[in-house]
Interface confidence: medium
Amino acid sequence: EPHSLRYNLTVLSWDGSVQSGFLAEVHLDGQPFLRYDRQKCRAKPQGQWAEDVLGNKTWDRETRDLTGNGKDLRMTLAHIKDQKEGLHSLQEIRVCEIHEDNSTRSSQHFYYDGELFLSQNLETEEWTVPQSSRAQTLAMNVRNFLKEDAMKTKTHYHAMHADCLQELRRYLESSVVLRRTVPPMVNVTRSEASEGNITVTCRASSFYPRNIILTWRQDGVSLSHDTQQWGDVLPDGNGTYQTWVATRICRGEEQRFTCYMEHSGNHSTHPVPS
């Protein structure tokens, strides 16, 4: 899994007038990391783990960056010509990643009223626009504005890519939290299914980093993919992750099945409770 930093900003307009505030959230390695507190005009860490990433900092740098990004997005929304009466939103999602081989990826996506209309690879500066005519119109509108704005030049996109990666590296380098290993807690439960069958569920929780193998085995052999159901690997809000895998088995054959877990070089097997 690559390390990633994901910015999610939203600005609103009402009856064609762009509102002064903005919404912003930042995810680090898929975990809610920062949000912009509109009432306090500050970037705020999301939970203790986020505070631990940078230690006792004032988050001024993050506040400044998010505020600048919010203002840019408000200006962009002001240049969308086809705004009708009522409430409208412009959302920008920007993601940068550092992979294990040290290669990087950066992209930017714009949504109007929740509909994707423009994407950009920030490394190649290649734009992608969905086929719908509404998306084409919106994209032309926004791209023309971005071209007109002296700040939104080739240099600017390179800087956006570089700044995101620089922040990500800063978090990774300064944080013991992001270099730690937290082994999962594994819990196996059973529940009644159809007559003669039971559903067994294996849950792994509170682990870090995100990479994990969790699978059911019968007589020591992994079951096929299509006989198991997997949950997504999701953040649990504490800087760690959780996931699950389930399968249906015949009652009476429980002892033949085990849940196999592999995480950060360690592995374990967990039987079905009787």
């Epitope: 306090k40 005009c41 500050r42 506040t63 400044r64 505020t67 203002k71």
Partner: antibody
């Protein structure tokens, strides 16, 4: 009608502790987004923000004075307090409390004057 | 800390003049800039919020402009009651800082 009023000792000796009270009406510090801060102004000089407390008891301090400052509140009595330890003659000023909601100070008290003198 | 620099320190004007007061931030603060007026022996009063947004009850002759690090407070037609000191405030980065003020005098 929103009003804020500061009260304090008026005169202190160097090294003593200053205790200020801001009593307000017309709004509540239990309302989400509400905050009250302290700002001071030496005679004939500019404004300096000192400390701020929010509805959720989040507190902000000016880093240059943080070790001396403690801000607190009594929501039920509509009061905010500021303590400054080890005052010096440089702390002689008018102290204002002000309401801050959406990023700016929209209502101010009349101020209370402190003189630090030996 | 963000340093707010106001100029000029003092401004002497004639009633009816249009005047501009300048405020510069040591780094970009977007539009998180607020203006206050303080008359002699009074507490400060909010004039303009977020660089250019007007405040209810403030005469329309007061207006604000600017973004980033350069800001201006304009008074369309100065009246004698406008005498006082005008402060700008950084509402963006902690700690919140004020400019040194511009004193407006009537000739």
């Amino acid at each position: 009608q929103i009003t804020l009023k500061e009260s304090g000792p008026g005169i202190l000796k160097p090294s003593q502790t200053l205790s200020l009270t801001c009593s307000f009406s017309g709004f509540s510090l239990s309302t989400s987004g509400m905050g009250v801060g302290w700002i001071r102004q030496p005679s004939g000089k500019g404004l300096e923000w000192l400390a701020h407390i929010w509805w959720d008891d989040d507190k902000y301090y000016n880093p240059s004075l943080k070790s001396q400052l403690t801000i607190s509140k009594d929501t039920s009595r509509n009061q905010v307090f500021l303590r400054i330890t080890s005052v010096d003659t440089a702390d002689t000023a008018t102290y204002y409390c002000a309401r801050r909601t959406q990023g700016y100070f929209d209502y101010w008290g009349q101020g209370t004057t402190l003189t630090v003198s030996s | 800390d963000i340093v707010m620099t106001q100029s000029p320190a003092t401004l002497s004007v004639t009633p009816g003049d249009r005047v501009s007061l300048s405020c510069r931030a040591s780094q970009s603060i977007s539009d998180y800039l607020h203006w206050y007026q303080q008359k002699s022996h009074e507490s400060p009063r909010l004039l303009i919020k977020y660089a250019s947004q007007s405040i209810s009850g403030i005469p329309s002759r007061f207006s604000g402009s600017g973004s980033g690090s350069d800001f201006t407070l304009s008074i369309n037609s100065v009246e004698p009651e406008d005498v006082g000191v005008y402060y700008c405030q950084n509402g963006h980065s902690f700690p919140w800082t004020f400019g040194g003020g511009t004193k407006l005098e009537i000739k």
